[in-house]
């Protein structure tokens, strides 16, 4: 069997500062040098793209800089961070990765990581 | 809304070359790999290029590797299919097609005939 | 490259009738990456359904996906007079991607 399968976890709950992590990993049936990895957002069977970057092998990823999400790759594992999210950004995250070079190119999609975000509760005001 | 308006087909004689345009609105091309998919007459459906995203990557069928090559103009949101040594089995209905967020080939244009003939 | 055979050829069948098409994979297709398309005579193809059973936007609950692995079908639950047409599956998780001869559905 050729297609490629993507691993990421079920379910991620964001620090309350806003930032999830977690590992996209996936089973190349090709020895890729590029490769690309996409974030996309499901909620309300709305799908958004969240970020993406290519990378090569043996590289960093580079997202752009304006970018929510930041990553760093080992072999066939993608570690992903996103900042920035507050409580209606929960959904469900999913990872999509592209080998786009050398030819065959392959196509992967994870089942998505529900990431839970939860606004953290004002201070309550102090008088001294 | 999503539009792809394909233009440039025509006759042609064996060997000669021909550029096939598509304009695309409603989305940024560079975000999206876009494809082109033949059809002769009477015939199901082929696959031929496909550009992916910033434009480094490009793959092609066998059957026309060497002589079309698949480019974009972001400013001007087009695409284009160079076709070159044309050879009558090149005679189809030529589709632009945007591949969508899962990979799948979401919107199609209305095709643009070419007849490769002598 | 994964060649795709669609049965049957041809379906010939009555408006109200149910439709039950085909689609047979080489090897291995991920039911993520398989999809089915319409073709009415001098028109484009249509999506209609993606991932072997996801929904395009727009298309009616009368067409449903099934499938996995290397045998997929495409179901019409009652036929209307708007779905006599060419389908054609196709895989699109690797290239080249590839699609299946078709399978014309006209009246009987």
């Known amino acids: 069997c050729k297609a490629m399968h993507v691993a990421q976890p079920a379910v991620v709950l964001a620090s309350s500062r806003g930032i999830a992590s977690f590992v996209c990993e996936y089973a190349s049936p090709g020895k890729a040098t590029e490769v690309r990895v996409t974030v996309l957002r499901q909620a309300d069977s709305q799908v958004t793209e969240v970020c993406a970057a290519t990378y090569m092998m043996g590289n960093e990823l580079t997202f752009l800089d304006d970018s929510i999400c930041t990553g760093t790759s080992s072999g066939n594992q993608v570690n992903l961070t996103i900042q920035g999210l507050r409580a209606m950004d929960t959904g469900l995250y999913i990872c999509k990765v592209e080998l786009m070079y050398p030819p065959p190119y392959y196509l992967g999609i994870g089942n998505g990581t529900q990431i839970y975000v939860i606004d953290p509760e004002p201070c309550p005001d102090s008088d001294f | 809304q999503v539009q792809l308006v394909e233009s440039g087909g025509g006759v042609v004689q064996p060997g000669r070359s021909l550029r096939l345009s598509c304009a695309a609105s409603?989305?940024?091309?560079?975000?999206?790999?876009m494809h082109w998919v033949r059809q002769a007459p009477g015939k199901g459906l082929e696959w031929v290029a496909v550009?992916?995203?910033?434009?480094?990557?490009?793959h092609y069928a066998d059957s026309v590797k060497g002589r079309f090559t698949i480019s974009r103009d972001n400013s001007k949101n087009t695409l284009y299919l160079q076709m070159n040594s044309l050879r009558a089995e090149d005679t189809a209905v030529y589709y632009c097609?945007?591949?969508?967020?899962?990979?799948?080939?979401?919107?199609w244009g209305q095709g643009t005939l070419v007849t490769v003939s002598s | 490259e994964i060649v795709l055979t669609q049965s049957p050829g041809t379906l010939s069948l009555s408006p109200g009738e149910r439709a039950t098409l085909s689609c047979r994979a080489s090897?291995?297709?991920?039911?993520?990456?398989l999809a089915w398309y319409q073709q009415k005579p001098g028109q484009a193809p249509r999506l209609l359904i993606y991932?072997?059973?996801s929904r395009a936007t727009g298309i009616p609950d009368r067409f449903s996906g099934s499938g996995s692995g290397t045998d997929f079908t495409l179901t019409i639950s009652r036929l209307e007079p708007e779905d006599f047409a060419v389908y054609y599956c196709?895989?699109?998780?690797?290239?080249?991607?590839?699609f299946g001869p078709g399978t014309k559905v006209d009246i009987k």
């Open positions: 409603g989305f940024t091309l560079s975000s999206y790999g």
């Open positions: 550009i992916w995203y910033d434009g480094s990557n490009k």
């Open positions: 090897q291995s297709v991920s039911s993520n990456y």
């Open positions: 097609v945007r591949g969508g967020i899962w990979g799948n080939f979401d919107y």
């Open positions: 991932g072997a059973s």
């Open positions: 196709q895989q699109y998780g690797s290239s080249p991607f590839t």
